[in-house]
Each structure stands twice: as C-alpha cells, then as structure tokens.
Interface confidence: low
C-alpha cells in the first residue's frame, strides 16, 4: 500500500524526505525562515500528513506563505517611511520611524529601523518589539536668538518664536468678590507641564498659609507674542497645580511650581519647550549672561502702588526681554541685607542684575525662566525662575532681581512630571 | 540603588583621634552632600556637619567646630569624618546619611552606623 | 538652635490603636519637619518630610500633620513592627544646625 511520492511546497520541506511512502508512514510539512504554512486559511508551523491504508494521503500538501508583519504601529510624533518597493511588510522588509524634526527627537538616538522578522514581528536592534519615544526637543528656539544683546526694565520687544518655551499663566479666581485676577510667567518644558515659581499659583490670601489656586481658575497662553491679539496663541487649561510643599510665603524660599496642562500642546515654531539643567548645587556661574522674557511691567518710572491700582493694564503689549548678568552670591546677599527689612537670600536662589541698574525683570514677569546658553549641548537651559525683588522700583540702582535657583530642584521636577531623570537628562550634559 | 558602607566600630583611647568612612554607591557621588549625625546612647541625634563632594563644600554645627573634620576620597566615592582629642562624651554612633532630594534637608538614606567607644 | 521638643519620652499602645506622637518646635519652622522611625541597633528610617507628605515606601497609617511649630505623627491601626523609637526633626535652620526631637518610644501595654 504505497502512497504517491509528495512534492515539498516552494519555500518549504518534507521530513523525513524518502523514495517510497507506505501505510502509516508520516512526514512533517514544514516552511523555510519567513515563511509560515498555509491550509485552509489558516497559518501554522508545521502540518503532519499520513499514508493511509488505501494509498492515499491524509491530506493536500499545504502551502508556505511569506510572513508578514502588517501595517506597523503608528508613533506618537513620529513618521513611518517604507525601505522597501511598494511599501512591503512582509519577511525582511524593512521600516524606518523617525521623529517630527525639528520639533521631536528619538530617545536615545535609536536608528528607528525595524525589519519585519520570521516571528511576523517588527524588530529593532536595540528596542526589540518595542516603539521608539519620540520626545520633545527642548532649548532650541526656531529662530535663533541673538548672541549680544546690548547692554521687563530697559528690555527690548522679542521676535515671536524667539522664546518659544514662554507661557503666559493668567489667574482669575471668580468665587471672590470683587474678582481676583493676576499673571504670571512660566516655562514649557515638555507638552504637558509648565514651570514658574511658587508665588504666581499661591491663593492670595491674608495670612501666611500656602495653598494652590483652584486649577479652574488658570489658563496658561503658549506661542503667544502680543497679548491684544491671542488669536494664534494655543491656550489651555491647567489639569494640576504643583507647588513646593517647602514654599515660604515669607521669605520665598522655594518658589517654584508646576503646572500640569489639560492637554498636552502641539508643538511648532512658536511652541517648544527649554531645557532643565543638571542637577547642580552651584547653579550658574556669577557673570554668566542670561536672557529673561514677560509681559511685565516695561517702564521704570511705574510705581508699586500704581501697578497694584492699575491690576493688569500694566502688561507690555508685546513680550520684551533683557540680558542680565549672574550676581555673585554674596554680593546680592551683601546689597540686601544692607536694606532695612527682612531679606533672606537663600541657597536656593541667585541673583542677576546690573550694579548700576536700568535693566531688570518686574512684576508680571514672575515665574519666568531666565536662560542660559550651554555651549556644549548647543541648547537654552532654563536656570532661574522671576521670584522677587527688594522694595524700590524695578532696575533701582543695586537692586538685584533674585531668581529661584533651579537646577536644586531637578530631581523634584522630574519626580512631579513622572519621568525618569535619565531620559532627557543626556541633553544638556557638560 | 542608594546604598552607604560605614566602617566597622573603633575602641579609642581619651585625647586620641579616629577616623571613620562612608562609601557612597548607587548614585552621582558629587550630586549630593553626606551629612553625619552623632547618636549617643540611648540617646537623641545631633547633626554635625555635611561634606558636598561637588565643590568640597563642608558645613558643620557649631557645636562640633573643632571636633570635627569632613574630607573626601573621590576615586572611592567615600567621605570620611574624624574626631579629634576624644573624650568619652564622643562614644557613640555616627551615622552618615543622604538626601533624598537636593534640596530638602531631611535623610532618607543612612549608613548602618559606626561605633565609637572612648575609653582608657 | 531651635529646639524641638518631644515631651513623652515613652508612649504605650496595643496593636490596632490609634496613636498620636508630638513635637513641639522653639520657633517657627514652617512646614519644614520630617519624622523618623528607630528601632534598636538601626539606623534611623524616614517617614514623613515636610510635615505631612509620606516618604515613597512608606505604610499609609503613619501621617503627618501641623505647620508654624506644633507637629503630629499619627499612627493609625498600630501593628507590631510599629513599636520603635520616633524623633522628628526641623530643617527650617539649615545651614545652622539640624535638629532633631528627644525621640518617643512606642512601647505595648
């Protein structure tokens, strides 16, 4: 009882592979690397035939089927480009995702290429199965900013994308009569949080308490350049408030917050986040030069008490910004507590000013980043955050703006925004 | 993970000195300050004094001015603390500890403990 | 230095109670006080830092609670492992000196 000789599938094999095939004898169909068998529509391993009594086999020989891993996953921020012709999936091909440049980068370098492997999965070198990250590209305004500013107070107007980290934070606290409604600065650092200081998101209250604002009575303004017209501006609402547990109404000690975006923004040319620093317990070096931006306050000659009165019609139309320099610490800690009056320049602060004053940030300008050129990584490092400044006008003579020292609070900010430190943290190495 | 290697315990005799380490692992040696807390027995904590291996910044209480002296071995990763002209008022443990956050003064991170006995 | 203050050297409690360990600054410290557990022949572990925010790892029935310069750990449901040694401490001074609470001892009935 001899069963037909039996042809192995193209792509495939029959073992064991002999002359002649009698009653009960079994082979095993089985398909090369990157092939799966096919029968009856349905893809497996191996298919096992017998020679039956009569001659006969038990089954057709199925056929091998190239693998194929289908349309590949879809990147957050990403793109998908096909290596190979006509856009193939199957065994072999090849994919490469990449980032939405200049605005996303890929985590770690990766290549971003994946080949469709035997298993009928898409593979990378290093990820294995898994997607790349495409992550925000942070410090890297759109237009470039400029190098020497000659030697906010005596500022000049900003090119819109010029400072595309900086994010108008507007309260307004309705449940109060008559309505409460003040601003502040803050610094996009990925597409979902903000950075500012402690004092601009704290309830305005009587005593000495901390407690956040309500979320629902902050809008925070990104990509925005003249606030007459926010039409282009992305506007969003505020889905957390963070501020430091350890904020010190009295002495500012601690002034900084976060702000957790509804949704996370569309970045572009006008919307980018600045880079964190490395976690450095000296923070920037005295006469290192930083640039700082807001709608504050840009006329030396506006008292406090008419800034008080007036509430927010003291905004600069147009987003100015100043280049000021890193005060030593105990120069600024000498010219404060030569003024009557409580001033505690602490270690998580530094100062930035000229001696001779003219130049400083104000009020409205709070919570904004003052940042610093790092050469080696080519990126704008967000350093400081607008705190506070001593009682006389802004850009008073020997009046140092001082500003919360930020890279002492890297650890806690990534510890908020849940990410691990490692993951941006190569950006901005020395 | 964060983890500090204290040196084993010392028997000294009044008016000597003895040096004891902390071997910091797990982390950026330079990113944070060791600090170093006195336990006498039975007793409260008292802070003596922080090394930052960052900049070799010391600070120190006070009341350990002089008693006290922080240097550091940065290719071991370890900070040392020595006492000088011992009496038996300095028996005792001498934790060192870490912050948890740069800029938060408390120690989530401690060192098993180095004991000190003073005695003739 | 600030002093703090912690007036019951020894408290006694059975498990499942509900136990309330306090501290008492000198001055005006904020919110900047953190507590520790101790038991015999450790190291101090921490449990709350800034007053009232519990360190990662940290069982939920240890809170914290108290601002300017009156403190509490409240122990709810006390299990046996409880039964240690708790100081608290202030960092409202730093860089002058640290300091920490005499320490309360958790003890049974």
């Known amino acids: 009882n001899e069963c037909p000789e039996l042809q192995p599938p193209v792509h495939g094999k029959i073992e064991p592979s002999q002359a002649k095939y009698f009653f009960k004898d079994q082979v095993l169909v089985s398909c090369d690397t990157g092939y799966k068998v096919l029968k009856d529509n349905v893809e497996m391993d191996t298919f096992q035939i017998e020679c039956l009594k009569d001659g006969t086999w038990s089954n057709k020989i199925p056929t091998c089927k190239i693998v194929d891993c289908r349309a590949p996953g879809e990147l957050e921020h990403g793109l998908i480009t096909f290596s190979t012709r006509n856009n193939l999936t199957t065994y072999k091909s090849e994919i490469k995702y990449s980032c939405q440049e200049p605005y996303y980068k890929m985590l770690n370098n990766n290549t971003g290429i994946y080949t469709c492997s035997a298993q009928g999965v898409w593979m990378n070198k290093v990820l294995g199965r898994s997607l790349p990250t495409c992550l925000p590209e942070c410090g890297q305004p759109s237009r470039s900013l400029p190098s020497l500013v000659k030697r906010i107070i005596g500022g000049r107007n900003a090119e819109p994308g010029l400072f595309p980290w900086q994010a108008l934070i507007v309260v307004e606290d309705t449940s109060r009569v008559p309505n409460d409604k003040w601003f502040g600065s803050g610094a996009l650092l990925s597409a979902s949080w903000i950075l500012t200081a402690a004092h601009v998101l704290r309830s305005q209250r009587r005593d000495t308490t901390v407690i956040p604002v309500s979320k629902e009575h902050v809008t925070v303004y990104l990509g925005l350049h003249d606030v007459r017209d926010k039409s282009g501006a992305v506007n969003s609402s505020a889905a957390r408030v963070v501020l430091h547990p350890d904020f010190n109404i009295q002495n500012y000690n601690h002034d900084i917050a976060l702000v957790q975006l509804q949704e996370p923004v569309p970045l572009g040319p006008h919307v980018m986040p600045v880079c964190l620093p490395r976690l450095e317990p000296e923070g920037p070096a005295p006469h290192m030069l930083g640039l700082v931006a807001g709608w504050g306050i840009s006329n030396p000659n506006v008292t406090v008490d008419e800034i008080i009165s007036s509430g927010t019609r003291t905004l600069s139309d147009v987003l100015q910004y100043v280049k000021l320099p890193v005060v030593p610490h105990a120069e600024c800690k000498t010219s404060y507590e030569s003024r009557s009056g409580n001033y505690s320049v602490t270690e998580n602060m530094f100062c930035a000013g000229y001696y001779e004053g003219g130049k400083d940030t104000c009020l409205g300008d709070s919570g904004g980043a003052f940042v610093i050129f790092d050469d080696l990584s080519q990126r704008w490092v967000v350093q400081g955050l607008v705190s506070w400044g001593g009682p006389e006008e802004c850009g008073s003579k020997q009046v140092y703006g001082v500003y919360t020292k930020v890279s002492n609070y890297v650890d806690w900010v990534w510890e908020q925004m849940g990410l691990p430190q490692s993951v941006v943290e190569p950006q901005v190495e020395r | 993970q964060v983890q500090l290697k204290q040196s084993g315990a010392e028997l000294v005799t009044p008016g000597a000195s003895v040096k004891m380490s902390c071997k910091a692992s797990g982390y950026t040696f330079t990113t944070y300050p060791i600090e170093w807390m006195k336990q006498n027995h039975g007793k409260s904590l008292e802070w003596i004094g922080n090394f930052h291996p960052y900049n070799d910044d010391t600070k120190y209480n006070e009341k350990f001015k002089g008693k006290a002296t922080l240097t550091v071995e940065k290719s071991s990763n370890t900070v040392y603390l020595e006492l000088s002209r011992l009496t038996s008022d300095d028996s005792a443990v001498y934790f060192c500890?870490?912050?948890?956050?740069?800029?938060?003064?408390?120690?989530?991170?401690w060192g098993h403990g180095t004991l000190v006995t003073v005695s003739s | 230095d600030i002093v703090m203050t912690q007036s019951q050297k020894f408290m006694s409690t059975s498990v499942g109670d509900r136990v309330n360990v306090t501290c008492k600054a000198s001055?005006?410290?904020?919110?900047?006080v953190a507590w520790y557990q101790q038991k015999p022949g450790q190291s101090p572990k921490a449990l709350i830092y800034s007053a009232s925010y519990r360190y990662s790892g940290v069982p939920d029935r240890f809170t914290g609670s108290g601002s300017g310069t009156d403190f509490t750990l409240t122990i709810s449901n006390v299990q046996s492992e409880d039964l240690a040694e708790y100081f608290c401490q202030q960092y409202n001074s730093y860089p002058r000196a640290l300091t920490f609470g005499a320490g309360t001892k958790l003890e049974l009935k």
């Open positions: 500890a870490r912050r948890v956050y740069y800029s938060y003064f408390w120690f989530g991170y």
């Open positions: 001055q005006n410290v904020g919110t900047h």
